[in-house]
Amino acid sequence: SEVEYRAEVGQNAYLPCFYTPAAPGNLVPVCWGKGACPVFECGNVVLRTDERDVNYWTSRYWLNGDFRKGDVSLTIENVTLADSGIYCCRIQIPGIMNDEKFNLKLVIKPAKVTPAPTRQRDFTAAFPRMLTTRGHGPAETQTLGSLPDINLTQISTLANELRDSRLANDLRDSGATIRIG
């Protein structure tokens, strides 16, 4: 029941993952890995943060957002078909078995030969906010309405329903704020 995101060969892919630090600068270690989340940490780690900074990264993988504010969304530069697969975002909240694990499926499509259509700006009407709740059973999807001024009170990936990376970029460009605490 991984949430699915898409990008085209040659584009940058965007895999959203967010949390709200308990206090500004009070960061939680996060890792991103290629492959589903294992029991501890991430498998095949591509990027890692600690309580202060990004302390490990590999080429083409970076955090474009402000990770000090909890935006730990992963950008993969210039994707190829080999980048398809499941990625794990793990937020390592201190405590007893407190980690939050999110498996995100990246699907890479061959580059379009024809010019891309005009990007949909009024995407809140076309794509109402969806929250995909993941557990051991099938994904349960519910509509939460349009995007602005949403306040989620749980750690979650942002825009789980936005399957296309460009739509996720639109979300960031729109200035919609999601507060997760």
């Epitope: 029991v39 501890f40 095949n44 780690v45 390592q92 078995m97 980690d99």
Partner: antibody, heavy 123, light 107 residues
């Protein structure tokens, strides 16, 4: 040379407590997840608990988390397992193990193990 | 919990034989599988991790394969020091779980 040496095992009555220790040497202890695995006499391996590098994240077998507490002291290169309200079924050899780790991997399998310490719970 | 089932439980073989031990997971664990070897009175030794990667210092006669729910450990030509008990362990789901073990004995 990597070494893990467990101590603190012994005979204890049901309902009693024990604190196991694992002294680590030959590696940078604070860089590694650490784990306790147990093995009842003549039986297979059972994961008990694990702890992350700085001790802020802990993981337990559900049935044990109310009675067992894993902790570490990186300054002393030591791992601990506090066991309370012990039962006969806790009788086992308890192994301390190091989670295999480098920056691009995950510490979900164990590359070095101690020799084990026997805990016997009996009246 | 993810159940790990090894087969056979015990196996008799001779030096030079090729043997295969299998491990089945009750659900998809991708390639998150490890194999250990344990000799009587000793602690386990890491052989293979991530289903097929040989641990440092492990002889090349050992090999691991599989993904999803079906895995195997093969010893291409048994040596006297290979007679031991072998355990698989999954590290996809909490709790970490081990197979019940396969005891490899001399025929």
């Amino acid at each position: 040379e990597v070494q893990l040496v467990e101590s603190g095992g012994g005979l204890v009555k049901p309902g009693g407590s024990l604190r196991l220790s694992c002294a680590a040497s030959g590696f940078t202890f604070s860089d590694y997840y650490m784990t306790w695995v147990r093995q009842a006499p003549g039986k297979g391996l059972e994961w008990v608990a694990s702890i992350n590098y700085d001790g802020r994240n802990t993981y337990y077998l559900d049935s044990l988390k109310s009675r067992f507490t894993i902790s570490r002291d990186n300054a002393k290169n030591s791992l601990y397992l506090q066991m309370n309200s012990l039962r006969a079924e806790d009788t086992a050899v308890y192994y301390c193990a190091r989670g295999y780790y480098y920056y691009g991997s995950s510490p979900n399998y164990f590359d070095y193990w101690g020799q084990g310490t026997l805990v016997t719970v009996s009246s | 919990d993810i159940q790990m089932t090894q087969s056979p439980s015990s196996l008799s073989a001779s030096v030079g034989d090729r043997v295969t031990i299998t491990c089945r997971a009750s659900e998809n664990i991708y390639s998150y599988l490890t194999w250990y070897q344990q000799k009587p009175g000793k602690s386990p030794k890491l052989l293979v991790y991530n289903a097929k990667t040989l641990a440092e210092g492990v002889p090349s006669r050992f090999s691991g394969s599989g993904s999803g729910t079906q895995f195997s450990l093969t010893i291409s030509s048994l040596q006297p020091e290979d007679f031991a008990t072998y355990y698989c362990q999954q590290h996809y789901g909490t709790p970490l779980t081990f197979g019940q073990g396969t005891k490899l004995e001399i025929k």
